[in-house]
Structures are given as C-alpha cells and as structure tokens.
C-alpha cells in the first residue's frame, strides 16, 4: 500500500494501547452538502418493495437512534398493486460504524462497533429449489 | 430523556474540548456474529433493479475501503428479462459515520464525518409528469 | 481507439428477415451495452433495441414482436434479427455503443449498413 | 413512448453568430434518481450522428466549449455561442430516462 509519511503536527499518544485507542473529535463534519435534498425520503412507500422505518434507540451508543427496514410483504407489488409472491421482497443490509460507551454510561470513552442494519428492501427472483 | 449516573471508572478527559474529544477503541466489536453470512451477498443480480459495486478507497478515512452500489438500469427488469421504463431503478442511500484523520496523514487523531453511501437498489413507481 | 462496424445484406425481399452484425472493437461487451438505431432516408432517428452489458435488453415497443438482439461477448459481436420487412424498412442501420453507465446516451456510432427492402 | 418536439426545423445562421436549438418533451424526463437524461447529437452530411451533450449539460470528450446545453423537465436548449463552417448538420436530441426517443432534428444552414 502506499506510505503516507505522519504529519509532525500529530497530538502525540500517551496511551499503552497506542495506537488501539485514538482521539476523536465528535464535531461532525457532514460531506453531503450536494446531495439531492429528496434522496430517497419516499422510495419506502412507492417500491415494489416497500418498508417501513422502525426507530431503534441505545443511550449507551452513538448515534443513539438508528432506523431500521423492514419490508412490508414476503412477495413484491405488481402492476396491478397486488402482492405477487413470484417474487421477494428482501432487505438490504450493511454493516456500519457506531460508537459504543465503554466502560458503560461514559462520556467521553467509546468502543468503535460494528452492527448490521437493514436499509430498504429491493424485489428479487427467488431461488427455487424442486423436488426430485 | 433518561438520566444514567456517570460510571465512576470512566477516564479523565483533561482536554480542553471536553466533550467533543473523546477516546475511542478502534478494537471493533462486531455485533454480527449470528447474521446470516450470505446476507445480501446475490441481491445485486437477483434484483429487478440489479446494482454494480464500486470500491471507494481512502487512506485517510477510517474505514478506508466503502463499497458503493450504481442501479445498472434506468427502469426495473420484467418478468421476460426485458428492461421496463414504466418502473425506475434508484439508488437506496444512507448517511453513515466514518473516521477521517485529522489532522491528515495522523495514526491516532481522528474526527467523526458523516457520509452518503450507496447501498443497493430498489424498483419504485415513477412521478409522471405530462406536459398539458 | 473505440470503432463499431455494422455488416449486412443490402437488398432484403419484403415479407423476408433481416439479419445484420455490429463487430466492436476497444471496449468490451461484458462492460458496455450496444444499441440499434435507424435511419430511413432524408428522415430522422429511431431506436430499435438494447442489449446491456449484463445481457438484459430493451426493446422498442412497436416493434418488438419483428425484432430479436442477441451477443457474442468472446467474438465481441452483437446480432439483430427483424422479421416480417416491408418497403417502409428501408433505411440506414446503426449500432452504437451506451457510454457505459447503463443510460445516459450513445456515445460512439458506426458507420452504418444501407438496407433495401424490395422485390 | 415519449415524443420529441424540435423546433424550427431549419436554422439559417451566419458564420460567427448564435445558434440556438429548442427541444420539448411530452413528459418530464427528470428521473426517480433526480437525473434527467436529455442529449444533444450532431449528424453532418454523410456521416452517423455524433453525441455532444449528455444529461443536458454535461460536454463530450473532445466537443468544443463553444457548444452548451440547458433546460430542464420539458424543455431544454442547445446553444453554439460563434458558429462555425463544421458545425452544418442536423442537431437531434434525444431522452433516454424512458424508452429512448428522439427529436426530428433541425437543420443547421449557412445564411
């Protein structure tokens, strides 16, 4: 990979996990300042894939609330708006950062986490498996 | 909201910024351990809105490599394998947290950013809009 | 460099079939979608057909009943069959190559193939 | 399908001078994904067409900055700012955000 010689004016680490625990700024810089204002607010609604957002909330995490998908029906929505169960309706996961307090209910002392969340659904062709 | 007592093992913080400076384990804790591994492994081609994946790498960002989806179509794939431009094809995007060195090129300072990735893609009902 | 090459007939009798080949070079099949577009003479452009990298297709919807695409990626060939001709086909036939994102436009163009439909 | 509307169908310029080519949608080509895919090709005498805007606005590789594109839901417009001798042909624009169409084209001629 390549070698990106460290910049002299580093905060230096007195830390014995060094460099397993490092220092964070929480003032958020948002990178999103061009993105499409609509995105995808009501894509939930008009997929053939629908789902609904379910508001998931730790104290103990940051970001405390996270919005979890979950799609509405097993089959997809035809043109007809009837569920077709031809097809599936499955979620789309990833997996994301999050900030864990640790020790528990410490300000200023994260764990770095990784979890899974379910972002929207999106229809597919379901593999059929037949009987012999 | 809940008010949770300060555990009293938790760290000194003697910067001056205290809060927005906190430390942070970079020891993932993965909360994954009992999802499904094939997870959305084949969504991408199974979808009627099948999505590419592009790397998205950056040394200075923590996690450097993010992999972003691109809807392969404008309309959604049919039942004869036809693409549909009745239906739409859209991206499903979700801000997520990431670590950015700062300053640059720093092993052990960081600051939260927030970013839009995204993740897969959905086949939704398209807005028409005639012209009278 | 980038170069598409259309090779057909000519001269069709009406009511026969049309069989015409695009042979590409510089790009690849498996990267890039291949569209047909044609011209009848002193007139505009219609477009006939898709075929997507990942080998989907689109087809005009008044003529998709006449008209089949299919590939070659090895041979980096595109094939187009359209049935059933009548005088009112004749035209020049392009192929031309999708910029690569899947919908945005057509970025390189053949040169074309005279066809005539008559007896 | 979604028609094309080009207007006027012949463009009498001097060399030098401003050209301007309007286009019309029967529908709004802006995209669930906010895109609109409306692009502007040239086809000189004898030859295929050539792409030189994509997505309204966007220049293709190699088209010179005198050519610029605009518009937006319906209606777009493709402007050379000093025309020029290489510049005669037909200006079709096309719409690719549903089944591909194009416009009937106008005529670029010398005055």
């Known amino acids: 990979g390549i070698t990106i010689p460290r910049n002299p004016g580093c905060p230096n680490s007195e830390d014995k996990n060094f460099p397993r625990t490092v220092m964070v700024n929480l003032n958020i810089h948002n990178r999103n300042t061009n993105t499409n204002p609509k995105r995808s607010s009501d894509y939930y609604n008009r997929s053939t894939s629908p789902w609904n957002l379910h508001r998931n909330e730790d104290p103990e995490r940051y970001p405390s609330v996270i919005w979890e998908a979950k799609c509405r029906h097993l089959g997809c929505i035809n043109a007809d708006g009837n569920v077709d169960y031809h097809m599936n309706s499955v979620p789309i996961q990833q997996e994301i950062l999050v900030l864990r307090r640790e020790p528990p209910h410490c300000p200023n002392s994260f764990r770095l986490e990784k979890i899974l969340v379910s972002v929207g659904c999106t229809c597919v062709t379901p593999i059929v498996h037949h009987v012999a | 909201g809940i008010t949770i007592p300060r555990n009293p093992g938790c760290p000194n913080s003697e910067d001056k910024n205290f809060p927005r400076t906190v430390m942070v384990n970079l020891n993932i804790h993965n909360r994954n351990t009992n999802t499904n591994p094939k997870r959305s492994s084949d969504y991408y081609n199974r979808s009627t809105s099948p999505w590419n994946l592009h790397r998205n790498e950056d040394p200075e960002r923590y996690p450097s490599v993010i992999w972003e989806a691109k809807c392969r179509h404008l309309g959604c794939i049919n039942a004869d394998g036809n693409v549909d431009y009745h239906m739409n094809s859209v991206p499903i995007q979700q801000e997520i947290l990431v670590l950015r060195r700062e300053p640059p090129h720093c092993p052990n300072s960081f600051r939260l950013e927030k970013i839009l990735v995204s993740v897969g893609c959905t086949c939704v009902t398209p807005i028409v809009h005639h012209v009278a | 460099q980038v170069q598409l090459k259309e090779s057909g007939p000519g001269l069709v009798a009406p009511s026969q079939s049309l069989s015409i080949t695009c042979t590409v070079s510089g790009f690849s099949l498996t990267t890039y979608g291949v569209h047909w577009i044609r011209q009848p003479p002193g007139k505009g452009l219609e477009w006939l057909v898709v075929?997507?990298?990942?080998?989907?297709?689109t087809y005009n919807s008044a003529l998709k009943s006449r008209l089949s695409i299919t590939k070659d990626n090895s041979k980096s060939q595109v094939f187009l069959k359209m049935n059933s001709l009548q005088t009112d086909d004749t035209a020049m036939y392009y192929c031309?190559?999708?910029?690569?994102?899947?919908?945005?436009?057509?970025?390189?163009w053949g040169q074309g193939t005279s066809v005539t439909v008559s007896s | 399908d979604v028609v094309m509307t080009q207007t006027p169908l012949s463009l009498p310029v001097s060399l030098g001078d401003q050209a301007s080519f309007s286009c019309r949608s029967s529908q709004s080509l802006v995209h669930s994904n906010g895109n609109t895919y409306l692009h502007w090709y040239l086809q000189k005498p004898g030859q295929s067409p050539k792409l030189l805007i994509y997505k309204v606005s966007n220049r293709f590789s190699g088209v010179p900055d005198r050519f610029s594109g605009s518009g937006s839901g319906t209606d777009f417009t493709l402007k050379i700012s000093r025309v020029e001798a290489e510049d005669l042909g037909v200006y079709f624009c096309s719409q690719s955000t549903h089944v591909p169409t194009f416009g009937g084209g106008t005529k670029l001629e010398i005055k």
């Open positions: 031309a190559r999708n910029d690569g994102d899947y919908f945005y436009s057509m970025d390189y």
């Open positions: 075929i997507w990298s990942d080998g989907y297709t």
